[in-house]
Interface confidence: low
């Protein structure tokens, strides 16, 4: 029902603690450069205003939309133009244009230092001094670096963070207690951030239909016993929640997410037997538990898919009359039967089936035309399977660092215009997928790999859109969300690329490399490797192996030498000459 005061309604639904947290996240995600203290001041002002509206919903401004209230608050900041430049121009616009304008100024790659973790002693001192402020600071630091983080989930991670500190700050060995807990929270939170960023990109760049298809596939895999109608109901609510969060309407998003969790718990008998353990938990944990829930067992005796989607004489009629419902049903039926497939695979199969029907239903004998549709879709299953098998074999053979190097070569050949540090960063990220997924059982490997790759490629696409350098990357990023990964996989050596002239400078090293931590050392070597590929994009695998071998031997020799710098100065030019000869 309509509420006189939207902000009072959300304050009552969420409670003061969560309300304040969500206001802080909202401000930090939009005003990423502002100091913490400035945000705390604004949060308190907004909270006091909400309380006044709870007391009297008819009070001045209480009837305004929450987005308008936030916009007014932001536009009243005296130093807005000074700090944020053209973001201040948004304030000349009327809502909803002002909201859209603010959204466009969110920075996915803000120029902020990494969020460093202080020593356990310092952490515990700060936490004990004022734990609300400490957790607020955590929300602020994460939000400004991840402006699309799923806000209600961030509240959950803040709660986990608080629990870890509460427990470990009393332990004898604080570091031993805290480090594994905080490492686990950080890793999960980073994945959560990337997952939400993909959802927002899906909605913003490819529209609601793309997001709904993604959700149908995912939920059908998780809840194979639920009816299609039930899945559709949940998808509709989930789309609303996700749109709100991606749009920066975090109070509405968190409140509607609570409602969705409540609905699912009330209807758990018709959704999944696994919901039981989630539904007894408190609000934040309940929603998180549902998000991470293990998939339910498949119902027994499911009929062959061909019965409804090939043999049925009404296929074209059903397709013509209610295209989205029919294709949604196909996606649901296919996904619930294949929990081992990635979302991308399932969506590509559904797309392939749709294309086949588009063609066949216009022909004289539609059935004869689409009778072999499942055989024709088989390559969409075989291609990723083969790719995962080959890459995991390579990973097993080379280890993570060697696998990253192979990917650095591969991706530099695909998009040599991309900057060297970016190529190294993504080769390392892609390489870590091997560590995450290749050790899993066969049934989980495929979905793990492709689902992670989707997150990494989405980040690459978002940053590339900001500063485009490669037409091929733009093409793969924008043409189709589900075909991103196959598009990148299909790229080979860029024939249009003019190789970089050879600069000995790029391959000159000094004794400083010997003292670097292992990760930094690897990155430096990978930078040189990428530069090498930019110089010789068509070098053979053998040539690359030889050069990398010589390079490793050179580093080992000089780092073991008494006079390291002299060794680098003397042997460096020899190595460069040798490499040039190898690659000639």
């Amino acid at each position: 029902e309509a509420h006189k005061s939207e902000i009072a309604h959300r304050f009552n639904d969420l409670g003061e603690g969560h309300f304040k947290g969500l206001v802080l996240i909202t401000l930090s995600q939009h005003l990423q450069k502002s100091p913490f203290e400035e945000h705390v001041k604004l949060v308190n002002e907004v909270t006091d205003f909400a309380k006044a509206c709870v007391a009297d919903e008819s009070a001045q401004n209480c009837g305004k939309a929450i987005a308008t209230l936030f916009g007014d608050k932001v536009c009243a900041i005296p130093s807005l133009r000074e700090t944020y430049g053209e973001l201040a121009d948004c304030c000349a616009k009327e809502d909803p244009d002002r909201v859209e304008c603010f959204l466009q100024h969110k920075d996915d790659n803000p120029n902020l230092p990494p969020f460093e973790r202080p020593e356990p002693e310092a952490l515990c001192t700060a936490f004990k001094e004022n734990n609300d402020r400490f957790i607020g600071h955590y929300l602020y630091e994460v939000s400004r670096r991840h402006p699309y983080f799923y806000a209600p989930e961030l509240l959950y991670y803040a709660e986990k963070y608080k629990n870890a500190l509460t427990e470990c700050c009393e332990a004898a060995d604080k570091a031993a207690c805290l480090t594994p807990k905080l490492d686990a929270i950080k890793e999960k939170a980073l994945v959560s951030s990337a997952q939400q960023r993909l959802k927002c990109a899906s909605l913003q760049k490819f529209g609601e239909r793309a997001f709904k298809a993604w959700s149908v596939a995912r939920l059908s895999q998780k809840f194979p016993k639920a009816e299609f109608a039930e899945i559709s109901t949940i998808v509709t609510s989930l789309t609303k929640v996700t749109k709100e969060c991606c749009h920066g309407d975090l109070l509405e998003c968190a409140d509607d997410r609570q409602e969705l969790a409540k609905y699912m718990c009330e209807h758990q008998d018709s959704i999944s037997s696994k919901l039981k353990e989630c539904c007894v938990k408190p609000t934040l944990q309940k929603a998180h538990c549902i998000l991470e829930i293990q998939r339910d067992e498949l119902p027994t005796e499911l009929p062959d898919l061909a019965v409804d989607f090939v043999e049925d004489k009404e296929v074209c009629k059903n397709f013509a009359e209610a295209k989205d419902v029919f294709l949604g049903t196909f996606l649901y039926e296919y996904s619930r039967r294949h929990p081992e497939y990635s979302i991308g695979m399932l969506l590509r199969i559904a797309k392939g089936y749709e294309a086949k029907l588009e063609k066949c239903c216009a022909e004289a004998d539609p059935h004869a035309c689409y009778a072999k549709v499942f055989d024709e879709l088989q390559p969409l299953i075989d291609e990723p399977k083969k790719l995962v098998q080959q890459n995991c074999e390579l990973f097993d053979k080379l280890g993570e660092y060697g696998f990253q190097n192979a990917l650095a070569v591969r991706y530099t050949q695909k998009a040599p215009q991309v900057s060297t540090p970016t190529l190294v960063e993504y080769a390392r990220k892609l390489g870590s997928v091997g560590t995450k997924c290749c050790s899993l059982p066969e049934t989980e490997r495929l979905s793990c790999t492709e689902n992670y790759l989707a997150l990494i490629l989405n980040r690459l696409c978002i940053l590339h859109e900001k500063t485009p350098v490669s037409e091929r990357v733009t093409k793969c990023c924008t043409e189709s969300l589900v075909n991103r990964r196959p598009c990148f996989s299909a790229l080979h050596v860029d024939e249009t690329y003019v190789p970089k002239p050879f600069h000995a400078d790029s391959f000159t090293f000094h004794a400083d490399i010997c003292t670097l931590p292992e990760k930094e050392k690897q990155v430096k070597k990978q930078m040189a490797l990428v530069e090498l590929v930019k110089h010789k994009p068509k070098a053979s695998e053998e040539q690359m192996k030889t050069v990398m071998g010589d390079f490793a031997a050179f580093l080992k020799k000089c780092c073991d030498a008494d006079n390291k710098e002299a060794c680098f100065t003397e042997d460096g030019p020899k190595l460069v000459a040798k490499c040039q000869a190898t690659l000639a």
């Epitope: 000995a504 391959f507 090293f509 400083d512 490399i513 670097l516 430096k524 930078m527 040189a528």
Partner: nanobody, 115 residues
Framework: DVQLVESGGGVVQPGNSLRLSCAAS????????MSWVRQAPGKGLEWVSS????????LYADSVKGRFTISRDNAKTTLYLQMNSLRPEDTALYYC????????SGQGTLVTVSS
């Protein structure tokens, strides 16, 4: 894209000091060691000094050891070179680079030491 912008150069008398800065962007600054290199008029590139990503390890060419100090501010993604007791032979274009390489990314900043 990667950007390195050097500043702080100028004309000074022998024995005086200068502080060079290099503002970095477009890459994960803390993940990379950084260096200063220089090119004297009509000469090739010469490595001057390097610093690790965390700032804990530094290295200097013999010609500048004891006079120059390299440092970095990871929060500001900026590299510095404090140059004391400058000599005429320090006259050169100074560049900051990613890693220990002798590649020139920025425009460089000119240091002239002359009486």
């Amino acid at each position: 894209d990667v950007q390195l912008v050097e500043s702080g150069g100028g004309v000074v008398q022998p024995g005086n000091s200068l502080r060079l800065s290099c503002a970095a962007s477009g890459f994960t600054f803390t993940s990379f060691g950084m260096s200063w290199v220089r090119q004297a008029p009509g000469k090739g590139l010469e490595w001057v000094s390097s610093i690790s990503g965390s700032g804990s390890d530094t290295l200097y060419a013999d010609s500048v050891k004891g006079r120059f100090t390299i440092s970095r501010d990871n929060a500001k993604t900026t590299l510095y070179l404090q140059m004391n007791s400058l000599r005429p032979e320090d006259t050169a274009l100074y560049y900051c680079t990613i890693g220990g390489s002798l590649s020139r990314s920025g425009q460089g900043t000119l240091v002239t030491v002359s009486s």
